[in-house]
Interface confidence: low
């Protein structure tokens, strides 16, 4: 036997008390699928949250964060304070990255500089609080005849020997 409530579309609920009539969702509520016996309450974007998309009878409101904060979690379930590049957020607020670490974003944690020597490379550009080190070529790359970092030779015309 087909459930009569399955005929109730999104935006309505199936009211048991009214012989399973499909009634519209009350204000500030929604049902995104058919056959619901109750409507979900709309999410309210309050405080540090701001409304990115208003609630409708068939879809929930969507929130993002006010300037100076960024979203965390599925569906922006939390707003976390931004920090500057070169900082990370701790329980005591934004703190500069320790020496040897960097953060090139307004969120997240400070990460250690790349250890160039692990790849047998040298440090080409030193790291800062905001930027990772830039690793240069390995000593082997600098040996005569190595082509990996030397610029390509200009194309030669046929029949001409190199000068």
């Amino acid at each position: 036997l087909q459930d009569p409530c399955s005929n109730c579309p999104a935006g309505t609920f199936c009211d048991n008390n009214r012989n399973q009539i499909c009634s519209p969702c009350p204000p500030n509520s929604f049902s995104s699928a058919g056959g619901q016996r109750t409507c979900d309450i709309c999410r309210q974007c309050k405080g540090v949250f701001r409304t990115r998309k208003e609630c409708s009878s068939t879809s929930n409101a969507e929130c993002d964060c006010t300037p100076g904060f960024h979203c965390l979690g599925a569906g922006c379930s939390m707003c976390e304070q931004d920090c500057k590049q070169g900082q990370e957020l701790t329980k005591k607020g934004c703190k500069d990255c320790c020496f040897g670490t960097f953060n090139d974003q307004k969120r997240g944690i400070c990460r250690p500089w790349t250890n160039c020597s692990l790849d047998g490379k040298s440090v080409l550009v030193n790291g800062t609080k905001e930027r990772d080190v830039v690793c240069g070529p390995s000593p082997a790359d600098l040996s005569p005849g190595a082509s990996s970092v030397t610029p390509p030779a200009p194309a030669r015309e046929p029949g001409h020997s190199p000068q």
Epitope: N16, P26, S32
Partner: antibody, heavy 117, light 107 residues
Framework: EVQLVESGGGLIQPGGSLRISCAVS????????ISWVRQAPGKGLEWLGI???????NYADSLKGRLTISKDNSKNTVYLQMNSLRTEDTAVYYC???????????WGQGTLVTVSS | DIQMTQSPSSLSASVGDRVTITCSAS??????LNWYQQKPGKTVKLLIY???SLHSGVPSRFSGSGSGTDYTLTISSLQPEDIATYYC?????????FGQGTKLEIK
């Protein structure tokens, strides 16, 4: 038959935590909301919070931070977790099905929680 | 929070009497009001939802009315099995709140 059965009540020390369950049958948690309501001995009903079909929750302001309502749709079970219990949390805890325009049309029999040292 | 105040807190009436219980909200609740019955030592039962809609299986002697901040539950002819405590509950705004209850006894 639609049924809600609470379990997990008992004697808890002040400062302790509570986790009670509401096992439902005869309907799906993906289409109905479930509320928790408590009743202190000889007192009236107090609404604690609700978990919606989509998993969202709303709580009584007085319990925010101490109360978490969650559910496992596959087990047809809703959970109430409360921390930092006080003697005034002693009550019968009911779960109730939220239907239609948010009336509680079916209630469990309740589980007694006693907070005492 | 919206405060719900029921009156009287208790009342005694005779079988066959017309009984009225009132519920007053601290602000307008747009008819978003339910009534529940709790018999001694028993669980809670829904009587009326959305101010005046009778829940299925509830005797027709129960009725509800009201608007704005003031709402009423009426039992047209009191029966012995109506001995219970009655609660109103608003769902206009979170947190949802109950009245303190009205205890009904038979004279």
């Amino acid at each position: 038959e639609v049924q809600l059965v609470e379990s997990g009540g008992g004697l808890i020390q002040p400062g302790g935590s509570l986790r009670i369950s509401c096992a439902v049958s005869g309907f799906s948690l993906t289409t109905y909301a479930i509320s928790w309501v408590r009743q202190a001995p000889g007192k009236g009903l107090e609404w604690l919070g609700i978990i919606w079909p989509g998993g969202g929750t709303n709580y009584a302001d007085s319990l925010k931070g101490r109360l978490t309502i969650s559910k496992d749709n596959s087990k047809n079970t809703v959970y109430l977790q409360m921390n930092s219990l006080r003697t005034e949390d002693t009550a019968v805890y009911y779960c109730a099905r939220g239907a239609g325009t948010w009336y509680f049309d079916v209630w469990g029999q309740g589980t007694l929680v006693t907070v005492s040292s | 929070d919206i405060q719900m105040t029921q009156s009287p807190s208790s009342l005694s009436a005779s079988v066959g009497d017309r009984v009225t219980i009132t519920c007053s909200a601290s602000q307008g609740i747009s008819n978003y009001l339910n009534w529940y019955q709790q018999k001694p030592g028993k669980t809670v039962k829904l009587l009326i939802y959305y101010t005046s809609s009778l829940h299925s299986g509830v005797p027709s002697r129960f009725s509800g009315s009201g608007s704005g901040t003031d709402y009423t539950l009426t039992i047209s002819s009191l029966q012995p099995e109506d001995i219970a405590t009655y609660y109103c509950q608003q769902y206009s705004k979170f947190p949802w709140t109950f009245g303190q209850g009205t205890k009904l006894e038979i004279k």
